[in-house]
């Protein structure tokens, strides 16, 4: 099966790489604009230059194109704890990230929030905090992992999953009580 091509892809595929078909005259292939620029006017004829203009401040194009307008620069979402890693240039969008000792949690494909990396109190670091993943903790004896925090087994209710993790501790306590001197 041949994949369905959109009108723009169909038009572009007629021309060699780096060129696009003139929208008013399909016998003319115009050179695409470099990244950092946009299409101001199509080339007037074969072998003639396409009129490309540089993107204005606050906009960009990251690849060769024949866009009539540059794309607006993204803004980092301060309300989600995001900070600017690198500012927008004519050929590259803003790069947003998190502060040191924080990680990104993606709520959806293009929306992330910054959270502090877990410190693994009452446990040890099993896997260090990474750009897109919180620290993975292993808890000390007498503690169990709940939502990536080491919680005392004294907070373990019988109905919860922690009973399995805290059972050895409970048995140890029993054992200590049973092994009293006569």
């Amino acid at each position: 099966l041949v994949p369905h091509l959109g009108d723009r892809e169909k038009r572009d595929s007629v021309c060699p790489q780096g060129k696009y078909i003139h929208p008013q005259n399909n016998s003319i292939c115009c050179t695409k604009c470099h990244k950092g620029t946009y299409l101001y006017n199509d080339c007037p004829g074969p072998g003639q230059d396409t009129d490309c203009r540089e993107c204005e401040s606050g906009s960009f194009t990251a690849s060769e194109n024949h866009l009539r307008h540059c794309l607006s620069c993204s803004k980092c979402r301060k309300e989600m704890g995001q900070v600017e890693i690198s500012s927008c240039t004519v050929d590259r969008d803003t790069v947003c990230g998190c502060r040191k000792n924080q990680y990104r949690h993606y709520w959806s494909e293009n929306l992330f929030q910054c959270f502090n990396c877990s410190l693994c109190l009452n446990g040890t670091v099993h896997l260090s905090c990474q750009e897109k993943q919180n620290t993975v903790c292993t808890c000390h004896a007498g503690f169990f992992l709940r939502e990536n925090e080491c919680v005392s087994c004294s907070n373990c209710k019988k109905s919860l999953e922690c009973t399995k993790l805290c059972l050895p501790q409970i048995e140890n306590v029993k054992g200590t009580e049973d092994s009293g001197t006569t």
Partner: nanobody, 119 residues
Amino acid sequence: EVQLLESGGGLVQPGGSLRLSCAASGFTFNAYTMIWVRQAPGKGLEWVSYIDPHGTITYYADSVKGRFTISRDNSKNTLYLQMNSLRAEDTAVYYCAKLPRAAPRFDYWGQGTLVTVSS
């Protein structure tokens, strides 16, 4: 005790409108970014929109951009979602929540309000 009570859902025809409300209590409403999420039948949670504490910064999922408008009234501790040009794919249970701060989990949910878009 934190409480979030959604209302305003119902059956509407494609192209129609609805306005959802979320009455909040038990926390300092005007200190939190508030969000709307939805869950379509048999699907996972999808972020719809959020609004910052002052009502100046908003976010919309691409699927609702230009059709839905989020707003809030801090004097009434109420969050709103105006839904226009509704489509069948907007059918879902809509929930409001406060944006978590310490960890990526929602500690409090309302019961949700069902929006059904059908002719």
